[in-house]
């Protein structure tokens, strides 16, 4: 029986999904199967089906690994001689960079005067709840650049967004040229949304999910990584080298301060910045260009490659020390990653035993700080945030399964990199 307290949900491979939630299943040995969409139906059943691919208008479409639908080769002469930016694939439909579209049924808490605006920017789909201006005319009209309807002659809408606006990656998509919904329609009764549950930093199309839907900005991003040459990332026409960070600049929303993108070799990895619930001062202030409030008069003390303030915060989020120990004996490598926390005061040690590249044993132990201090071989490698640790542990769960049945050489080392907090661009978060 799957109904509890009149709240229906679905179970798929030991994970819980809300009614209306959609995701790509994670299936061995392929990983995320992008050609299959699953949805949690009202009766608690999961329905999965193959993505229907749109017709491509070229003679020899190419099939790119990790993308479902074939597409026209990038080498084709661009239409109208415009420089082509990275497009977005969503639900079997390709959107061009800068293209805006409307999604329905995404937000449970959509107000009657709000609509869902989605935008494709450099391969990422961003959706936001847009608060529409009050209409003063009887017959408002739709405009191409907004999900809100406007009065004739009102001119172009500004794209300011209030603190209460919510962004989300879409789960379902209205027909590309559908008639925009009136913002006085009742909000949709069913909630959709949600992404494949896979840590963003390690997947080809990462999902960054915010669990607590509190006030402020909720961000979900899907990253389509096409193969690029050279050790750089290109975003919004700008080139970033490995390790550089920036805030995405979206045509629809301007600079999104609460999302930080980092160039990891050639992959753009974006994540939501979590602001702390408590600050070390009584009256933190909101500063232009920063996502989180800051305490006045505090100068940030910088560690190599990382930006922390004197209370051990990184971009407003508390940080904790990460230790590592690597011990080799009789052809067996024991690698330990440890996170020291204050609440509760303990050390969480993740132990990996690897022989000839195959994972022999993986376990987690929680020990007191005193006990930890007596353990040999550990050295401090970085400080990290709880949100990065969460991404690390999710990725760890995936690769612990994967590496027990096949040879893994760099997977764990690559995953540990998630814990390193890069210095953000110009010291901004």
């Amino acid at each position: 029986e799957q109904v509890k307290h009149s709240e229906t949900y679905c179970m798929f491979q030991d994970k819980k999904y809300r009614v209306g939630e959609r995701w790509h299943p994670y299936l061995e040995p392929y990983g995320l199967v992008y050609c299959v969409n699953c949805i949690c139906s009202e009766n608690g059943n999961v329905l999965c089906s193959r993505v229907r691919c749109p017709n491509v208008h070229c003679l020899s479409p190419v099939h790119i690994p990790h993308l479902c639908c074939p597409r026209c080769p990038d080498s084709l002469p661009p239409v109208n001689n415009k420089v082509t930016s990275k497009s977005c694939e969503y639900n079997g439909t390709t959107y061009q960079h800068g293209e805006l579209f409307v999604a329905e049924g995404l937000f449970q808490n959509r107000q009657p005067n709000q609509c869902t605006q989605c935008s494709c920017s450099e391969g990422n789909v961003y959706c936001g709840l847009k608060t529409c201006p009050k209409l003063t005319c009887a017959f408002p009209v739709s405009v191409p650049d907004s999900c809100c309807r406007v009065c004739r002659g009102d001119g172009e809408l500004s794209w300011e967004h209030s603190d209460g606006d919510i962004f989300r990656q879409p789960a379902n998509r209205e027909a590309r040229h559908s008639y925009h919904r009136s913002h006085y329609d009742p909000p949709p009764s069913r909630q959709a949304g949600g992404l494949s549950r896979f840590p963003g930093a390690r997947s080809h199309r990462g999902a960054l999910m915010d669990s607590q839907q509190a006030s402020g900005t909720i961000v979900q991003i899907v990253i389509n990584n096409k193969h690029k040459h050279g050790q750089v990332c290109v975003s919004n026409g700008k080139t970033y080298s490995h390790g550089e960070s920036w805030h995405p600049n979206l045509r629809a929303f301007g600079i999104v301060e609460c999302v930080l993108c980092t160039c990891n070799v050639t992959k753009q990895e974006c994540k939501k910045i979590h602001c702390p619930n408590r600050y070390p001062c009584k009256y933190p202030q909101k500063i232009d260009g920063k996502c989180c409030k800051v305490c006045p008069g505090k100068k940030a003390k910088e560690l190599p490659g990382q930006s922390f303030d004197n209370k051990g915060y990184f971009c407003g989020e508390e940080t904790m020390p990460v230790y590592e120990s690597v011990f080799m004996e009789d052809g067996e490598t024991t690698r330990k990653i440890a996170l020291e926390t204050e609440r509760p005061p303990q050390v969480e040690v993740h132990v990996w035993t690897i022989r000839k590249g195959i994972l022999q044993h993986f376990h987690i132990e929680k020990i007191s700080k005193r006990m930890f201090e007596e353990l040999p071989h550990f050295k401090l490698v970085t400080r990290t945030t709880l949100s990065q640790w969460k991404i690390f542990t999710e990725g760890e769960a995936q690769i612990s399964q994967m590496c027990s049945s096949r040879v893994c050489r760099t997977e764990l080392e690559d995953l540990v990199k998630v814990l390193y907090l890069e210095r953000s661009e110009k010291g901004h978060c």
Epitope: E28, P29, Y30, V36, N45, V46, L47, C48, R50, S405
Partner: antibody, heavy 118, light 107 residues
Framework: QVQLQQSGAELVKPGASVKLSCKAS????????IHWVKQRSGQGLEWIGW????????KYNEKFRDKATLTADKSSSTVYMELSRLTSEDSAVYFC???????????WGQGTSVTVSS | DIVMTQSHKFMSTSVGDRVSITCKAS??????VAWYQQKPGQSPKLLIY???TRHTGVPDRFTGSGSGTDYTLTISSVQAEDLALYYC?????????FGGGTKLEIK
């Protein structure tokens, strides 16, 4: 076009081993998993396991873990299944099949008949 | 292991009839179900996957449906060439398992 060509019929003695092959063509060998399925005469289908040339990942049905060994040769785009300590219970037709990226066994080999008899 | 049960070992039908072959899983398999057709002396041939997606080249008289534990393969108008063995298979969890098969025969 996609093809899976399996080796010819085998007549083997009890206790011996046999190595069946499945040669893939018409697609990128390392991108798809090859599965093996057993069918005894007049009976249903039983899944033995898979080999994924892309990563070397192997998954066995526990029932066949001590019976079958899956290997591959990337240079010839061939997956092998070795059956050991054969008994009359192992007399069957063995099929190899390709698992598409969207999780469908879309192409099958013609099958290899193995007869265990003294 | 998940057990896939095809309750009818044989089904008699006439050309032009509509026929439904059923398959029941011992637990929820979340539409991770495929249907195969096998003719004597041949390899199985994929018809339907993910419970309802018709494989390329399969005539549209074949449709798949179902969710949870109950799945159905329907042939809307049986043709002579459809007389064969039909197997359902789950790929929700390993070991992947097949139903015992349903043989479609002419009355």
């Amino acid at each position: 076009q996609v093809q899976l060509q399996q080796s010819g019929a085998e007549l083997v003695k009890p206790g011996a081993s046999v190595k069946l092959s499945c040669k893939a063509s018409g697609y990128t060998f390392t991108e798809y998993t090859i599965h093996w399925v057993k069918q005894r005469s007049g009976q249903g289908l039983e899944w033995i396991g898979w080999f994924y040339p892309g990563s070397g990942s192997i998954k066995y049905n526990e029932k066949f873990r001590d019976k079958a060994t899956l290997t591959a040769d990337k240079s010839s785009s061939t997956v092998y299944m070795e059956l050991s300590r054969l008994t009359s219970e192992d007399s069957a037709v063995y099929f190899c099949a390709r698992l598409d990226r969207d999780y469908a066994m879309d192409y099958w080999g013609q099958g290899t008949s193995v007869t265990v008899s003294s | 292991d998940i057990v896939m049960t095809q309750s009818h070992k044989f089904m008699s039908t006439s050309v032009g009839d509509r026929v439904s072959i059923t398959c029941k899983a011992s637990q929820d398999v979340s539409t991770a179900v495929a249907w195969y057709q096998q003719k004597p002396g041949q390899s199985p041939k994929l018809l339907i996957y993910w419970a309802s997606t018709r494989h390329t080249g399969v005539p549209d008289r074949f449709t798949g449906s179902g969710s949870g534990t109950d799945y159905t393969l329907t042939i809307s108008s049986v043709q002579a060439e459809d007389l064969a063995l039909y197997y359902c298979q789950q790929h929700y969890s390993t070991p992947w398992t097949f139903g015992g098969g349903t043989k479609l025969e002419i009355k």
